[in-house]
């Protein structure tokens, strides 16, 4: 018989309801807003804000100020109050929509609902290792802004993404803003729009470069400004928007704005569409060519990326590459395919694709048909002329309008669909070692750790835990502070390491072993921790094997047995090859002497799969009793694999040495012919992996065996007449004298 | 008007090396990406090397991988592929092209580079 | 690597006639990163089509693209006496980026 050891699922080295408990701030109401702060001279600080109120923390997650930033009108608004005796405009909660840094000075600012959508600067106070705020600043000069004017009306109650960008000595805040038409006739915000600080911090520069939706599109086009990021020569934006001026407004799409980050003008503002796609590699009859489009964007993210992404994206080492989260629709609900899905989009191609559309449109030969796009900002027009216009004036440049470059930038989920059911809710990047790993939060307010890797069927977890109780979704946006990740999920902000919250969810020594070195996971006896969790005898070296099971449970006391071991940690190598003295077996006090590999045996093993097999030929000592033993394996002396070394003893218990009896032949002639069927009865005759019948020295072929019977065919007599009959059984004669006489047919 | 112009082409050992020059006028330069693509005599089309318009981005043919470099000078106009340990399958007719998302839409006229003892 | 098949190797026909030529890919070539080129003895390989169904600047209306996934076609609707060349189609989509083996249209 042909025995094999049972799979383990891979998912059974760990366990994802192991309870961490990481570092967190309750802020008394939904987290709105959260940014960090990190200085050169060791000082830092996360910035919280919720209804009303801005919260000031520590790095360790404590409180160390908080300010009144609402209601308007009411006496106690700190931020109200610094500009100067109001009343301002209606009275009413300030909801946080903005809150940046500006690098530049270093300074914190805020913008919220109230107060046609003002903002406040918060100069930063290092003091010691924690900073404070000095008094705000309001940025907001009565006298310049009128409600058809407004440089200082910032924030729009629906939603507003904010980069600021240091040029020379200035500040440039780079701004969208969804709108409707509501909103637009409240002090004008716009849709888009450059605005330099003032150097005496009294608002913004008037005069600002900006785009709107046009007033005959506002009730219809509505856009959701996603993300903003600031890398290299360019600010970026990614919106959610409706595919199409003229059809139906739910049919949605992504799409990313670039703005040049050298030059506060708008005239080589540029839009693309981002196509996300679940391609799975076998595609259902009906399934869309091309994959399954997931249009909508829900979160995103830029980082440079590791070595080991890098080449699988075809790119350098350290490049920058957007990473997004997306859905199939607003509701992200479920469909065929994955909940979310994660693209990639190298801005060196994104960059690439824009810069020839923009040729395309403008070099000549004319690309007859090509429209210039952005109807919603501006008027139709075809490509190179400028909007709305027939034809370039000799002084103007096609290349100094804003364009929609006609083609899309198309990618397909990097993990191939396996986020299934996971609805992503919030997204952050990093580069640890060569590893790039998405730390993502959910909607049911768990956080997994993943590396970002193509072309597995099966997720690389570093972690995947819950932030607390409540189950509540994590918010949007994530920041960092050092080696830590800001985390927002109802009224709590949550500190989760880079390197993951810990190693307790590795459950066996080798899954611990082979996890990423930056996690600082170690063998701690029987459980996987970081150093300081178990000091004594906490090592990174060396697992035991693992004995999980063997075959069979028993075995003659005379003869011997051929005993296959499962586990893991046997070999470290897929080859299953042993140096010769490094794996000792013993069952009880027997030993058990190791059979070289079959090679033609060996069997894949996919990597969603683990097992290990090891066989072992027993032959009892004299000495050994019958009855119940333990099988133990002991490996020592093993060259190291690529993560540790094999060394020490797994003992299990339940193997039993018995002695198989013969009690009862028949019948005891049959025709010389063969053929007939003998049954043997006794005692423990199926124990072991070998038993034969010999008639006469030849092999009496086995029909069925159980513990108390043994059936099987006579082979052919030479003459008539009576013959030894006896049984073997791991090789060793079974006791008895027993004759079978042939007849003649 | 467009115009790809290479260079740099000729006789070689094999084990030897080459640098071919591409040289662009007629249009911006530094927002295109670029390739070079070869054809052996009576054989098909053979793609070689991509780079993209601000260099960070660089692909290769399997055939060629570890032995050519494809680079570019936006401030001179030009796009350049080095090759190194030269073998007889390499001889052929190098064409440098323009473009990408939008196909390779205007194409040199070649150097021949032949590599033989 | 994606392989590009093109068929029928060599298209004996008449001018006036149609021309269809077949690019057939050894895995999906999503979002239609495919173009066709024309090559004539002696001279640069010339874009005809991307993006499977975008005719390229300049190129006349009888050369049309089609087709999407792992099966593509180039349409020339009336053969002119210039149109006899090799055609390829090529993939720009994974990495490497390949041809097809060509197909040789000669005036039967």
């Known amino acids: 018989e042909d025995w094999q050891c049972p799979r383990t699922p891979y998912a059974a080295s760990r366990d994802f309801d192991v309870k961490y408990v990481v570092p967190s701030f309750s802020a008394g109401g939904l987290v709105q807003a959260m940014v960090t702060y990190e200085g050169d001279r060791n000082e830092s600080a996360v910035f919280v804000a919720i209804r009303n109120r801005l919260h000031v923390l520590g790095p360790d997650l404590k409180s160390v100020q908080s300010l009144a930033t609402g209601p308007a009108g009411d006496p106690g608004c700190q931020t109200c109050a610094a500009c100067g005796p109001g009343p301002h405009g209606p009275p009413g909660d300030t909801d946080t929509k903005v809150l940046v840094l500006d690098p530049a000075l270093p300074a914190l600012v805020s913008c919220g609902s109230s107060l046609q959508g003002r903002c406040f600067l918060h100069d930063l106070e290092p003091q010691g290792t924690a900073v404070h705020l000095a008094a705000p600043a309001c940025l907001f000069s009565a006298h310049h802004n009128r409600p058809d004017d407004c440089p200082d009306c910032v924030a729009s109650p629906l939603g507003t993404r904010v980069t600021v960008v240091e040029q020379g000595q200035a500040s440039y805040f780079y701004v969208a803003s969804s709108l409707d038409a509501a909103v637009a006739a409240s002090f004008s915000p716009r849709s888009v729009s450059i605005r330099r600080l003032k150097a005496d911090a009294s608002g913004f520069a008037p005069g600002f470069v900006a785009l709107s939706v046009l007033p005959k599109h506002l009730v219809s086009y509505s856009i959701e400004y996603v993300h903003s990021f600031h890398t290299g020569a360019f600010v970026y934006f990614l919106t959610v928007q409706p595919a199409s001026v003229t059809d139906d407004p739910s049919a949605l799409h992504t799409r990313l704005a670039r703005l040049s980050a050298t030059e506060p003008e708008l005239g080589d503002y540029r839009e693309l569409v981002l196509d996300c796609r679940f391609a799975p590699k076998r595609r259902r009859r009906g399934a869309p060519e091309g994959g399954q489009p997931y249009p909508v964007l829900r979160v995103a993210h830029s980082a440079p990326v590791g070595a080991q992404l890098a080449t699988e994206l075809s790119i350098a080492e350290g490049q920058e590459v957007l990473f997004g989260v997306f859905v199939t629709g607003k509701d992200g609900g479920p469909g065929v395919g994955p909940n979310s899905v994660v693209c990639a989009f190298p801005i060196d191609l994104l960059d690439t694709l824009i810069d020839e559309g923009v040729e395309r449109c403008c070099e000549s030969p004319v690309h007859p048909g090509l429209r210039r796009g952005l109807d919603f900002f501006q008027s139709p027009s075809f490509c190179p002329n400028p909007p709305g216009l027939e034809a370039l004036s000799p002084n103007t440049s096609c290349r100094h309008f804003p364009l929609l470059v006609s083609s899309s930038f198309s990618r397909v989920d990097l993990f191939n669909g396996l986020l299934g059911p996971v609805q992503v809710t919030a997204l952050y990047v990093t580069r640890l070692d060569n590893v790039t790993v998405a730390h993502m939060g959910t909607m049911d307010g768990r956080i997994l750790q993943v590396e970002l890797v193509r072309s597995l069927n099966y997720l690389l977890y570093v972690s995947n835990f819950s932030l607390g109780d409540s189950g509540q979704p994590v918010q949007r946006d994530v920041s960092r502070l050092g080696d830590h990740l800001l985390f927002a999920s109802g009224d709590q902000v949550f500190q989760v390491p880079i390197q993951g919250p810990g190693c307790r969810h590795f459950l066996t020594c080798g899954r611990c072993l082979r996890a990423w070195h930056f996690m600082g996971c170690g063998w701690c006896g029987n459980m996987c921790g970081q150093q300081k969790e178990c000091p004594g005898s906490w090592q990174q070296d060396h697992c035991p094997p693992k004995l999980t099971e063997f075959h069979p449970h028993s075995g003659p006391l005379r003869g011997s047995t051929r005993l296959t071991l499962c586990g893991s940690n046997f070999y470290l190598h897929p080859s299953g090859l042993v140096p010769e003295g490094t794996h000792q077996v013993t069952v009880g006090q027997s030993p058990c002497r190791p059979l070289p590999k079959d090679s033609s045996k060996l069997r894949p093993v996919p990597r969603k799969d683990f097992v290990e097999e090891f066989e072992c030929e027993l032959e009892p000592l004299g000495t050994q009793a019958v009855g119940p033993t333990n099988v133990s394996l002991t490996v020592t002396n093993m060259p190291p694999g690529k993560h540790f070394r094999v060394d020490g003893t797994s003992v299990l218990r339940g193997f039993s040495f018995m002695e198989p009896v013969l009690i009862a032949v028949q019948p005891l002639f049959g025709p010389r012919a063969g053929g007939t069927c003998l049954t043997l009865e006794g005692q423990s005759l199926s124990v072991g992996t070998s038993r034969a019948v010999l008639v006469n020295g030849t092999e009496c072929l086995l029909a069925r065996v159980s513990e108390g019977q043994l059936l099987c065919a006579t082979p052919p007599g030479a003459t008539v007449a009576s013959v030894p009959l006896s049984l073997q059984v791991g090789g060793a004669q079974v006791p008895g004298s027993w004759t079978f006489q042939y007849r003649e047919d | 008007q467009v115009q790809l112009v290479e260079s740099g082409g000729g006789l070689v050992q094999p084990g030897g090396s080459l640098r071919l020059s591409c040289a662009a006028s007629?249009?911006?330069?530094?927002?295109?990406?670029m390739s070079w693509v070869r054809q052996a005599p009576g054989k098909g089309l053979e793609w070689v090397s991509y780079?993209?318009?601000?260099?960070?981005?660089?692909y290769y043919a399997d055939s060629v991988k570890g032995r050519f470099t494809i680079s570019r000078d936006n401030s001179k106009n030009t796009l350049y592929l080095q090759m190194n340990s030269l073998r007889a399958e390499d001889t052929a007719v190098y064409y440098c092209?323009?473009?990408?998302?939008?196909?390779?839409?205007?194409w040199g006229q070649g150097t021949l580079v032949t590599v033989s003892s | 690597d994606i392989v590009l098949t093109q068929s029928p190797a060599t298209l004996s026909l008449s001018p006036g006639e149609r021309a269809t030529l077949s690019c057939r890919a050894s895995?999906?070539?999503?979002?239609?990163?495919l173009g066709w080129y024309q090559q004539k003895p002696g001279q640069a390989p010339r874009l005809l089509i991307y993006?499977?169904?975008n005719r390229a600047t300049g190129v006349p209306a009888r050369f049309s693209g089609s087709g999407s996934g792992t099966d593509f076609t180039l349409t020339i609707s009336s053969l002119e006496p210039e149109d006899f060349a090799t055609y390829y189609c090529?993939?720009?989509?994974?990495?490497?980026?390949?041809f097809g083996q060509g197909t040789k249209v000669e005036i039967k």
């Open positions: 092209a323009r473009g990408y998302f939008h196909g390779m839409d205007y």
């Open positions: 007629g249009f911006t330069f530094n927002s295109y990406s």
């Open positions: 780079i993209s318009s601000r260099s960070s981005t660089t």
């Open positions: 895995q999906s070539v999503s979002f239609d990163y």
């Open positions: 993006g499977a169904s």
């Open positions: 090529f993939q720009y989509l994974i990495v490497p980026f390949t």
